[in-house]
Amino acid sequence: SIQGTSLLTESCALSTYNDQSVSFVLENGCYVINVEDCGKNQEKDKVLLRYYESSFPAQSGDGVDGKKLMVNMSPIKDTDIWLNANDKDYSVELQKGDVSPPDQAFFVLHKKSSDFVSFECKNLPGTYIGVKDNQLALVEENDESCNNIMFKLSKM
């Protein structure tokens, strides 16, 4: 279960392992997610990250001690929209939210190094937000795709 109040809310630019920027572009009245090279002086799109604490059942071997850090993400341009994991076609999409985000909008935050994080789908364990063909998609973690699921959060 995810504990109600957010631990932290922060605004960051999201970039890939290869230093491409994740941006949100308005097309036909809807935002789409792009992954593209960003010029040195070009302003990067920001994401609003809301951090939550999640505890989970005792069978994990950690008893009540087991806690994960979850995030949900919105473009700063429109914080009523959430990044959503679509388990039907393994895509990442933006969805207009209800009062509270669904499970598909929560991602377990993995700190892979001091600089890079990964986002594991709460509702699809072992599946992460990754980069495929200049788009965000859901990918399973393996050695070949390791860098594809690494993202840098830069506080602007």
Epitope: L8, G61, D65, K68, L69, H110, K111, K112, S113, K155
Partner: antibody, heavy 122, light 107 residues
Amino acid sequence: EVQLVESGGGLVQPGTSLKLSCLASGFTFNNYWMTWIRQAPGKGLEWIASITYTGGGTYYPDSVKGRFTISRDDAKSTLYLQMNSLRSEDTATYYCTRANYYYNTYGGFPYWGQGTLVTVSS
Amino acid sequence: DIQMTQSPASLSASLGETVSIECLASEGFSNDLAWYQQKSGKSPQLLIYAASRLQDGVPSRFSGSGSGTRFSLKISGMQPEDEADYFCQQGSKYPLTFGSGTKLEIK
């Protein structure tokens, strides 16, 4: 119950080496970042080394970089600190600590071992 | 490096008194700030994380607040068992850094 038990401390001469161990139990070891923190007698706390939950990344302050190495053996649920070229200023109680959340470093250190004393003196 | 300046260095308080300890960071960061209590001869114990979250099992007389560069720990109603050293720690940026500590004694 989460337990962290350090061992390997003792009296050593300057310039020599020592390896500390920390045996972890009561939690899924390979899901957590682990960290060594030390405290010189009568002084404050100093972060010494951290290792990612995968073991793929290690981090040190300048004061020990190149001399100390943190490592982990997930099969044995054990954390290590290899200390080389020891100096008198490395004299301290060394604590093994565990992060608050799976896969992460956010949220401080809720679990600490009892500490092991390292004395570097000729 | 983020320097954590903790004040006061020492403090004596009467039983039941409300006590505050402050930590000032050399640069602003998100709320990854923890407070620890260390009793004589013992390992430190986490009291507060995420600047204001009370760690499980910690009495509710302890509270944390602050953001950016200024953080504080408050003990509302000093108890005999609160006599200890207190440290703040930032986890936002490597190297991780601690405040130099506050020694809290009973008057």
